[in-house]
């Protein structure tokens, strides 16, 4: 019997192709040259290797690149990416957005794994900031990505990147995160006219201060109740009844349904009853 450390005669791999799926694990170890594997990584993903076989291929790459894989290999990892640990990924230097996209594609449709989180972290740190193209890519794959960042991390987002943010990307952001994002959005959209500006800024208003809400109330924006309910309580409290009426426009009637919930409840308690009565909604201060 052939010793399991030696490649059987005639089985030395000349190229990475589908014949290798018939190799036992020890044959892959013995018969596939790591340098050949590295140069033909683009073929691996098209070959239905078992996960045990992929373990062998990963081991070969680990031996060839103990300090971390080069980007030429990383870009073509495909399913092999799922075999990588966060520790493996921390050794990488990923600079190409194409590489990032290729690896995110492997994990598409599933929650962000520790591997993906580490990959993104390495990529963003390598770039120094969350530029628009990166943010575009990340929020396309993970709509909740932005809200997974700390306020400190969000501070590195340049205002120009805000154009890539869609309303659903902010669904799970808390007020501290919106506090950071709102001024960036205000800066990004500052040259837009009134109605267009409101459409863009609306999702970020959970971070808006009182003076900006007062300014919006002068622009006939007709803010919906869902947006109003996400405003900072401390920003809403100083608004007058007239300002809230102008801010909400026809949606002002919705205050009645929300009178027991913050920030509406707290705002009502701050108003004079005579002023509340002008709304004709039966609100009791």
């Amino acid at each position: 019997e052939v010793e399991k450390t030696a490649c059987p005669s005639g089985k030395k791999a000349r190229e990475i192709d589908e014949s290798l799926i018939f190799y036992k694990k020890w044959e892959l170890e013995a018969c596939v040259d790591a340098a050949l594997l590295a140069t033909q990584m683009d073929r691996v993903n098209a070959i239905p290797f078992t996960y045990e076989q992929l373990d062998v291929l990963k081991h070969k790459l680990d031996e060839l690149y103990p300090q971390g894989y080069p980007e030429s290999v990383i870009q073509h990892l495909g399913y092999l990416f799922l075999k990588m640990s966060p520790e493996d990924i921390r050794k990488w230097n990923v600079t190409s957005l194409e590489t990032l996209k290729a690896l995110l594609e492997v994990n598409k449709g599933h929650e962000m794994s520790p591997q993906v989180a580490t990959l993104i972290d390495r990529f963003v740190k390598g770039r120094g900031q969350l530029d628009k193209d990166t943010l575009d890519t990340l929020t396309a794959f993970y709509p909740g990505y932005l809200c997974s960042l700390s306020p400190e991390e969000l501070s590195s987002v340049p205002p120009s990147s805000i154009w890539a943010v869609r309303p659903q990307d902010l669904d799970t952001c808390d007020p501290r995160q919106l506090d950071v994002l709102y001024p960036k959005a205000r800066l990004a959209f500052q040259n837009m006219n009134g109605s267009e500006y409101f459409v863009k800024i609306q999702s970020f208003l959970g971070g808006a201060p009182t003076e900006d809400l007062k300014a919006l109330s002068q622009q006939n924006v007709s803010m919906d109740l869902a947006t109003f309910m996400k405003l900072r309580t401390d920003a809403v409290l100083p608004l007058t009844v007239a300002e809230v009426q102008k801010l909400l426009g026809p949606h002002v009637e919705g205050l009645k349904a929300e009178e027991r919930h913050r920030p509406v409840r707290d705002w009502i308690l701050r108003q004079r009853q005579d002023d509340l009565d002008t709304l004709g909604l039966g609100l009791q201060g």
Partner: nanobody, 118 residues
Framework: QVQLQESGGGLVQPGGSLRLSCAAS????????MGWYRQPPGNERELIAI???????VYRDTVKGRFTIRRDNAKNMVYLQMNNLKSEDTGVYYC????????????WGQGTQVTVSS
């Protein structure tokens, strides 16, 4: 995941033919790889043939030209047509399903015995 059940095994003379069938309990249309393995007496299980989602077959060298894998996604069936059988084809044949990527899984059938002997 799907459950798999093989049938069609039996005793056949060298040079004869058999067709193995594998019935899946659920849809196989989105399963990346369907395949057949065999376990010769006293040896480990080895891959014989696979069919990807489009039905393209890939074969072990020793069965090329003699065996044909066919995948019928509409009927959730996989077949292995075995012609010109040899004594070394003797073994238990297993149907196998494998999903690639995230949420991957593999399923095995119970196996069906094929004996090639005169």
């Amino acid at each position: 995941q799907v459950q798999l059940q093989e049938s069609g095994g039996g005793l056949v003379q060298p040079g004869g033919s058999l067709r193995l069938s594998c019935a899946a309990s659920g849809s196989i249309s989105k399963i990346a790889i369907m395949g057949w393995y065999r376990q010769p007496p006293g040896n480990e299980r080895e891959l014989i043939a696979i069919a990807n989602m489009t039905g393209t077959g890939v074969y072990r060298d020793t069965v090329k030209g003699r065996f044909t894998i066919r995948r019928d996604n509409a009927k959730n069936m996989v077949y292995l047509q075995m012609n010109n059988l040899k004594s070394e084809d003797t073994g238990v044949y297993y149907c196998h399903a494998r999903q690639l990527g995230v949420g991957s899984f593999e399923s095995w059938g119970q196996g069906t015995q094929v004996t090639v002997s005169s």
